[in-house]
Interface confidence: medium
């Protein structure tokens, strides 16, 4: 079910681009969009268990919507309260960086981090 | 996905089993053989950089018979790239460790990855 473009990782019928370059959250979002993908939307915290020993944090596609007073993924769906139990402590002005071992933290969206893009193939 | 076994990852025309269990170098070799694959080989620098993102440390298929022998790959070819701590006579198996190739004791328990080319 997977045929990922060069430099992308295929895993469980998804393709992931794992950057080694640091960008702001907005720059990361645009770079993913330019490759017909979106910043990582997690289904569960073991989605990236193939890199769970990584020590890096990566921008993901989660931002706070003032309109909906909720943390939303890029496709408009709401963050599950079970995904990041500490999400209530996140500063709503910030963006979310994720470590593949399951941790997330909020950082200024203007900070530069690595990022992960995701394409679903089915 | 594709032609890779379930729970393996694909990258650049290869399949990788990203292990989480620790084994000695020889046990890792056997574990990969049992999965119809080889202990991780690194064909080029780009692959090494990719693997360092995925996993900070793992055995690779490079070893030497003693500190007086050259480092070789599993198919017997000389391995020409720098392996740190090579002057230590007790460290005769190679490990990928965050963009570095280092020598380690073959009996150490270290995470292993397997690979086979599509």
């Amino acid at each position: 079910c997977c045929s990922c473009q060069e430099k992308w990782v295929g895993y469980r019928c998804n393709c992931y681009f794992i950057s080694s370059e640091q960008k702001t959250w907005n720059e990361s979002r645009h770079l993913c969009a330019s490759q017909k993908s979106s910043l990582l939307q997690l289904q569960n915290t073991d989605e990236l268990d193939f890199m769970s020993s990584s020590q890096q944090f990566y921008w993901i596609g989660l931002s706070y919507s003032e309109e909906h007073t909720a943390w939303l993924w890029e496709n408009g769906s709401a963050l599950s309260q079970y995904l990041f139990p500490s999400f209530e402590t996140f500063n709503t002005k910030n963006c979310i960086a994720y470590n593949p071992n399951g941790n997330a933290l909020d950082e200024s969206c203007e900070d530069k981090n690595r990022y992960i893009c995701k394409q679903q193939l089915i | 996905c594709g032609h890779c076994p379930e729970e393996w990852i694909t990258y650049s025309n290869s399949c990788y089993y990203i292990g989480k269990e620790r084994r000695t170098w020889e046990e890792s070799l056997l574990a990969c053989t049992s999965k119809n694959s080889s202990l991780l080989s690194i064909d080029n620098e780009e692959e090494m950089k990719f693997l360092s993102i995925i996993s900070p440390s793992s055995w690779i298929g490079v070893f030497r018979n003693s500190s007086h022998h050259p480092w070789v790959t599993m198919n017997g070819l000389a391995f020409k790239h720098e392996i740190k701590d090579s002057d230590n006579a007790e460290l005769n198996c190679a490990v990928l460790q965050v963009n570095r190739l280092k020598s380690a004791q073959c009996g150490s328990s270290i995470i292993y990855h397997c690979k086979h080319k599509l």
Partner: antibody, heavy 118, light 107 residues
Framework: EVQLVESGGGLVKPGGSLRLSCAAS????????MNWVRQAPGKGLEWVSA????????YYADSVKGRFTISRDNAKNSLYLQMNSLRAEDTAVYYC???????????WGQGILVTVSS | AIQLTQSPSSLSASVGDRVTITCRAS??????LAWYQQKPGKAPKLLIY???SLKSGVPSRFSGSGSGTDFTLTISSLQPEDFATYYC?????????FGQGTRLEIK
């Protein structure tokens, strides 16, 4: 013996273009990432750009993005830096530097001066 | 971009002195730090990589330490040929960055 020799520098007017070359010898060029680093007169070192061994990964400093293009020809053992829309602040000695499989810059060229002035 | 701040910016010392130069990163870079020596009119020369690994051929009086955000280059007993400018560099992520340099002069 590893050797890196830059060429193509000189005086150019603001807005002009220049192409730097770096001829490599004494090692397997196609196995190594290569970088350009510059140093303005009396100032510190500034990384400019990097290209991986088979050109799959290319990176630029923000200060040159969109104006400079790094490339390589492994058949000719050569690294290039195409510099367009040059500015006075691009005046510097430009060095090419080799990476050893993820190690930092272990060999450098002697440098070539680029002067941007009207 | 990750910023590297070296201190001091310049330093006067005598032959035989023990000298320490520090480099602080604006965010954690694991041990992905190198130290270079540069003499006037010459290309930089790699001394230390991985924060503490001495490059082959570099005298053992040079040593490096640190991890995360704080790093140190130490010269245990200064020799006349050690008077130069020293730079730290992070290679944890792109863009790669250098410290501003530390100029080591003869007292």
């Amino acid at each position: 013996e590893v050797q890196l020799v830059e060429s193509g520098g000189g005086l150019v007017k603001p807005g002009g273009s220049l192409r730097l070359s770096c001829a490599a010898s004494g090692f397997t060029f196609s196995s190594h990432s290569m970088n350009w680093v510059r140093q303005a007169p009396g100032k510190g070192l500034e990384w400019v750009s990097a290209i991986s061994s088979s050109s799959s990964y290319i990176y630029y400093a923000d200060s040159v993005k969109g104006r400079f293009t790094i490339s390589r020809d492994n058949a000719k053992n050569s690294l290039y830096l195409q510099m367009n829309s040059l500015r006075a602040e691009d005046t510097a000695v430009y060095y090419c530097a080799r990476e050893e499989w993820g190690l930092p810059f272990d060999y450098w060229g002697q440098g070539i001066l680029v002067t941007v002035s009207s | 971009a990750i910023q590297l701040t070296q201190s001091p910016s310049s330093l006067s010392a005598s032959v035989g002195d023990r000298v320490t130069i520090t480099c602080r990163a604006s965010q954690g870079i694991n041990s992905a730090l190198a130290w270079y020596q540069q003499k006037p009119g010459k290309a930089p020369k790699l001394l230390i990589y991985d924060a503490s690994s001495l490059k082959s051929g570099v005298p053992s009086r040079f040593s490096g330490s640190g991890s995360g955000t704080d790093f140190t280059l130490t010269i245990s007993s200064l020799q006349p040929e050690d008077f130069a400018t020293y730079y730290c560099q992070q290679f944890n992520s792109y863009p790669l960055t250098f410290g501003q340099g530390t100029r080591l002069e003869i007292k």
